[in-house]
Interface confidence: medium
């Protein structure tokens, strides 16, 4: 079934990072608009992005209600200038999205090194805990709150003067590593969910941070700090 001069959406794709979740689709509309519906497998459909000319819809508010649920969305196509009419019995064309389970499928955002501090031959590297749009009791939860022990970080570190990388892993947001005295090191971190077996088990690497830069040095203690 269909509505005059409208085509069904296609290429419905979920784009999700740290639970910020957007449904994208094609085609760019010429003479039609779209409405999106989302539901859990057992729930009712809820309409979002009413009669939009965009080809994306932010569904974050819906999926953060329960990130472990599996969601399905569908995109309806209506003629441009459409006003909902009680007299219309014809169902507009629509297309279903793939199923989407945020907890398993959201991409891990690029982490940030919050600080590093050297004391003698040890360096403490701290990863910034990212906030998500998942809420509990009107409080936003951090990535660590949501994933708990499912989330680890991998640290890559190397002497500024060489290219040989070493790695360390942590179940928390802190690393304590051994370094050679008098050497400057560079650091990069990656968020990982080891239990995932898909391409989205790792984030992209954080920006590289290096010791010995003027904005990171504390003359009084000889420690190196870098704060964003």
């Amino acid at each position: 079934s269909g509505t005059t001069n409208t085509v069904a959406a296609y290429n419905l794709t979920w784009k999700s990072t740290n639970f910020k979740t957007i449904l994208e689709w094609e085609p760019k509309p010429i003479n039609q608009v779209y409405t999106v519906q989302i539901s859990t497998k057992s729930g009712d459909w809820k309409s979002k992005c009413f009669y939009t000319a965009d080809t994306e819809c932010d569904l974050t508010d819906e999926i953060v209600k329960d990130v472990k649920q599996t969601y399905l969305a569908r995109v309806f196509s209506y003629p441009a200038g459409h006003v909902e009419s009680t007299g219309s019995t014809e169902e507009p064309p629509y297309e279903n999205s793939p199923e989407f389970t945020p907890y398993l499928e959201t991409n891990l955002g690029q982490p940030t090194i919050q600080s590093f501090e050297q004391v003698g031959t040890k360096v403490n590297v701290t990863v910034q805990d990212e906030w998500t749009l998942v809420r509990r009791n009107d409080t936003f939860l951090s990535l660590r709150d949501v994933f708990g022990k499912d989330l680890i970080y991998t640290l890559y570190y190397w002497k500024s003067s060489s290219s040989g990388k070493k790695t360390a892993k942590t179940n928390t947001n802190e690393f304590l590593i051994d370094v050679d005295k008098g050497e400057n090191y560079c650091f990069s971190v990656q968020a990982v969910i080891p239990s995932r077996r898909t391409a989205n088990r790792k984030s992209t690497d954080s920006p590289v941070e290096c010791m010995g830069h003027e904005k990171g040095e504390s003359r009084e203690t000889g420690h190196h700090h870098h704060h964003h």
Epitope: D145, F147, K149
Partner: antibody
Framework: QVQLQQWGAGLLKPSETLSLTCAVY????????WSWIRQPPGKGLEWIGE???????RYNPSLKSRVTISVDTSKNQFSLKLSSVTAADTAVYYC??????????????????WGKGTTVTVSS | EIVLTQSPGTLSLSPGERATLSCRAS???????LAWYQQKPGQAPRLLIY???SRATGIPDRFSGSGSGTDFTLTISRLEPEDFAVYYC?????????FGGGTKVEIK
């Protein structure tokens, strides 16, 4: 109702290895973390480390070089080994279940089931 | 390491009185990972509160938890004879998981 039953040698000499085992009755190892905690006489609680059913471990850095926690899923039990013991390791040792409880978007963690404790004395 | 400092060390009260126990963390702790335990002599600790303010199964409603960040509180609204014990706070968010030094609630 899940119960933890623990056993092991109660009297050790310095430099020996402490070995304790905790059996899980009425429930599965899967889906939980399994911890060891100790309490020196008249003092507070100290977390030693934990293991998941898959064998992933986390240890207290202050004890890491001497501690091994292992799991035997076929027997539904987990074990603690602490090497090179000294008098400072004299304590009541508890095993406990660390439960990850998922609610409204995030995890809570808490130790909701405990063994009765095993008194370990290190003395020459 | 996150250090949890409990105060007071000892609280001397009578049955029926209100007890307020404090737990202060050396750095911010997610409330998801903050728990309170009760321990009586010769017994293992018993879970009272998890997630800073949720009562564990079977815990009477005279026990309540509150707080966030670095300051957490356990309140016993009306002390019963069986409540006289040592109380520990614990954080399970950052390795090593740590316990406070304990507050002993004793009969006055």
């Amino acid at each position: 109702q899940v119960q933890l039953q623990q056993w092991g040698a109660g009297l050790l000499k310095p430099s020996e290895t402490l070995s304790l085992t905790c059996a899980v009755y009425g429930g599965s190892l899967s889906g939980y973390y399994w911890s060891w905690i100790r309490q020196p006489p008249g003092k507070g609680l100290e977390w030693i480390g934990e293991i998941g059913a898959s064998g992933s471990t986390r240890y207290n850095p202050s004890l890491k070089s001497r501690v091994t926690i292992s799991v035997d899923t076929s027997k539904n039990q987990f074990s603690l080994k602490l090497s090179s013991v000294t008098a400072a390791d004299t304590a009541v040792y508890y095993c406990a279940r660390d439960t990850p409880y998922y609610y409204e978007g995030g995890y809570y963690y808490y130790m909701d089931v405990w063994g009765k404790g095993t008194t370990v004395t290190v003395s020459s | 390491e996150i250090v949890l400092t409990q105060s007071p060390g000892t609280l001397s009260l009578s049955p029926g009185e209100r007890a307020t126990l404090s737990c202060r963390a050396s750095q911010s702790v997610s409330s998801s990972f903050l728990a309170w335990y009760q321990q009586k002599p010769g017994q293992a600790p018993r879970l009272l509160i998890y997630g800073a303010y949720s009562r564990a199964t079977g815990i009477p409603d005279r026990f309540s938890g509150s707080g966030s960040g670095t300051d957490f509180t356990l309140t016993i609204s009306r002390l019963e004879p069986e409540d006289f014990a040592v109380y520990y706070c614990q954080q399970a968010g950052v390795v090593p998981y740590t316990f406070g030094g304990g507050t002993k609630v004793e009969i006055k």
